[in-house]
Every structure is written in structure tokens, then in C-alpha cells.
């Protein structure tokens, strides 16, 4: 009697069960009442991650530096090669095809909003009492230092990007 | 808060010209400025834009042939192997998003100035 | 290169109507966008900016709205000043991006 289901790493062809192919390699021929399934390595560049019967490997993702994208971690004949995005961009999906730059807020510029997956970062200029010196994407807008608390005076007036400098109180003798 | 270009005038194809665009009670080293165009009777056009830092970036069809910089309350725009298709109202525009790079969105623009190429 | 179009290229509203403009563009712009009331013989103004955000001293009639490729621009209550010319401009920057016009085309808006 011809089987109607095989076990696990097997599949049913022309009524016998054959062996799958192992992750990293490809089906190149079906088992037969005399041989074994014959299965052949993934090229460079091809991997397969599960027990199959492909014919063909899939060829590893290529990571689009034109895209802001970098290896993560190189494939093998087993695993996709993982792309992630160059230092301080971000994957616009789950599957990081591809980066967008989170926009930075000049100096001058506190971030209102960070950056989410629907809109870019949102800038918006330091008040008088508060500067940033940096150019970021997360930074907002700081408060110039109290002298006052201190026990200091007002050395140097603050600006929209630079704090205040602080210094002694002239001590009368 | 003003901005005033000028320098626009009738050139012969080939020539090279420079724009200007004066500002008033704008700080320069804090925001953005624009150039955008307008040939007559048609639409608006991004040139490109000069940031706080003096980094400047330009529509894909601007590289080469035009160059932004500034000075304290000016900023310049170079032209150059001018054409036909380059007849048009010149705009300078102040930038506010505050962005560190790339394009802004603009909210005080000069009258313009008229750049004619003819030959 | 970053892509804007906008439509229609004319409208025609009676004062008092609405009128929607579209303006899409070629990828996501995140809504850095922003929207200009251009009047013959004069600079752009702007009128939106963030894709929703009003401008200083524009009206609450103008509404934006919109994310990712797709933007709105619409006008109620039309009133004859608001004949003119407005333009979508995008001035998203993904550090890579370029424009062959951060423009729409302009849609004229016709006040009868």
C-alpha cells in the first residue's frame, strides 16, 4: 500500500516518500524506489533556511548602500544576509529595505517632535531663556543656566545657541 | 524682516550672472535661505538652498551650473552658461524648519528680480 | 529624483464653495510639506506647512491634511481673494534624496 503521508524532512512524490533537502542545499533530483533524494549546495550568494525540495536558491538580499543601507551580519548558505541602516538613519519597515535620515534641528533649533514613522522631526526655534548648540534629532531646546541660584552673576549674556556664562559676584572690600 | 534680491538683467546666452539677495533682520547664521524661479506664465522651481552652516544643496538639474553662498546679510546666487530656459523671475525666500540639511519651507520672499536671456 | 504632482491643474468653485486640491508625490515625504498662495505679480505666500500646520494670520478655511505620498489642500467658504495660483512643496530630506522640483505644477483657482 502507497503511502499517503510521510514523516517530518519528507515529502510524498509519485507515491513514496523522499528525503527534503537540508537548509543550504537545493533538490537537484527526486529519490526513486532505488535512490535517495539528491540534493546539491546553494552557490555563493544563494542560501535556503528550511528541509525543502527547491530547485532553485534564493539569492541573498543586497544591502543598498544607495539606500543608507549596511551589512548587519553576512549570509551563509542557511541564512539571508540582515541589512541595517548606516549610523543614524532608520529602517522605514520591519524588513529594513530601506532608511530614511530622521532629520536634525540646526543649533539654535529644538526638536518639537521626534521623528516617527509617519512624519520627519520637527524643529522649533529656541526661545530667549533657552538655546541648543548641537545639531540632533532629539535634543530640545535647553534652559539658559540660573546665576542667581548660584550665588554667580551674569558674565556673559545667553543666546539662542549658547547658554550663559557665569561668573563671580563683584565683592565690595 | 525683509529680503530684496537684485541683479537681474538682459543676457546673452553663455553669459554668466550673479544674483543677490539682501536681507533685513534676519539672522543669516540662524536660518535657511532659497532660491526658487518662475519663467513667465509657468510654475515655481526649486534651486537649491544654503543653510545656517553655509551646506548647500540644489535641485538635480541646478548642480553645477548654480552656486549658493552668503555673506553677513547677503546671499549670492552664481550662474553660469546661461540659456533661454533660464528666462524667469528669480525668488529668495527665508527658510524656517530649522533643519541642519536638506530643502525648508519658506516664508518671507522677496518681489524677485527679472533674469532675461536673450540673444 | 523626489517627484510632485499636483492636480487638478485648474478649478473653477462658486464663492461660498469648497475646492480640493491633490498633490501626491513619488515616495513617502513623511508630511514635510508644505503649501504656497501665489497671486499674478506677486512673491508665493505661505499658507501650511507640516502638511496640516496653518500659517501665521491664514485663515482656518484652509485646510491640510494627508501622509506618506498623498496630500490635500482644501479650501471652504470660497471668497474672491482666494483666487490664485497654490503650490505643494515637499522639503523632505532623507540625506540621499534629491529634487528635480520640490514643486507641484500649481493648480489656478478660479473664484466665480
Known amino acids: 500500500e502507497p503511502p499517503t503521508a510521510c514523516r517530518e524532512k519528507q515529502y510524498l512524490i509519485n507515491s513514496q516518500c523522499c528525503s527534503l533537502c537540508q537548509p543550504g542545499q537545493k533538490l537537484v533530483s527526486d529519490c526513486t524506489e532505488f535512490t535517495e533524494t539528491e540534493c546539491l549546495p546553494c552557490g555563493e550568494s544563494e542560501f535556503l533556511d528550511t528541509w525543502n525540495r527547491e530547485t532553485h536558491c534564493h539569492q541573498h538580499k543586497y544591502c543598498d548602500p544607495n539606500l543608507g543601507l549596511r551589512v548587519q551580519q553576512k549570509g551563509t548558505s542557511e541564512t539571508d544576509t540582515i541589512c541595517t541602516c548606516e549610523e543614524g538613519w532608520h529602517c522605514t519597515s520591519e524588513a529594513c529595505e530601506s532608511c530614511v535620515l530622521h532629520r536634525s534641528c540646526s543649533p539654535g533649533f529644538g526638536v518639537k517632535q521626534i521623528a516617527t514613522g509617519v512624519s520627519d522631526t520637527i524643529c522649533e526655534p529656541c526661545p530667549v531663556g533657552f538655546f541648543s548648540n548641537v545639531s540632533s534629532a532629539f535634543e530640545k531646546c535647553h534652559p539658559w543656566t540660573s546665576c542667581e541660584t548660584k550665588d554667580l552673576v551674569v558674565q556673559q549674556a545667553g543666546t539662542n545657541k549658547t547658554d550663559v556664562v557665569c561668573g563671580p559676584q563683584d565683592r565690595l572690600r | 524682516q525683509s529680503v530684496e534680491e537684485s541683479g537681474g538683467r538682459l543676457v546673452t546666452p553663455g553669459t554668466p550672472l550673479t544674483l543677490a539677495c539682501t536681507v533685513s533682520?534676519?539672522?543669516?547664521?540662524?536660518?535657511?535661505m532659497s532660491w526658487v524661479r518662475q519663467a513667465p506664465g509657468k510654475g515655481l522651481e526649486w534651486i537649491g538652498i544654503i543653510n545656517s552652516d553655509s551646506n548647500t544643496y540644489y535641485a538635480s538639474w541646478a548642480k553645477g551650473r548654480f552656486t549658493i553662498s552668503k555673506a553677513s546679510t547677503t546671499v549670492d546666487l552664481k550662474m553660469t552658461s546661461l540659456t533661454t530656459e533660464d528666462t524667469a523671475t528669480y525668488f529668495c525666500a527665508r527658510g524656517v524648519g530649522g533643519y541642519s540639511s536638506g530643502p525648508d519651507y519658506l516664508d518671507i520672499w522677496g518681489p524677485g528680480t527679472l533674469v532675461t536671456v536673450s540673444s | 529624483d523626489i517627484v510632485m504632482t499636483q492636480t487638478p491643474a485648474s478649478v473653477e468653485a462658486a464663492v461660498g464653495g469648497t475646492v480640493t486640491i491633490k498633490c501626491q508625490a513619488s515616495?513617502?515625504?513623511?508630511?514635510?510639506l508644505a503649501w504656497y498662495q501665489q497671486k499674478p505679480g506677486q512673491p508665493p505666500k505661505l499658507l501650511m506647512y507640516h502638511a496640516s500646520d496653518l500659517a501665521s494670520g491664514v485663515p482656518s478655511r484652509f485646510k491640510g491634511s494627508g501622509s506618506g505620498t498623498e496630500y490635500t489642500l482644501t479650501i471652504s467658504d470660497l471668497e474672491c481673494a482666494d483666487a490664485a495660483t497654490y503650490y505643494c512643496q515637499s522639503y523632505y530630506y532623507s540625506g540621499i534624496n534629491t529634487y528635480g522640483n520640490a514643486f507641484g505644477g500649481g493648480t489656478e483657482v478660479v473664484v466665480k
Open positions: 515616495q513617502s515625504i513623511y508630511r514635510s
Open positions: 533682520g534676519i539672522d543669516l547664521s540662524t536660518w535657511t
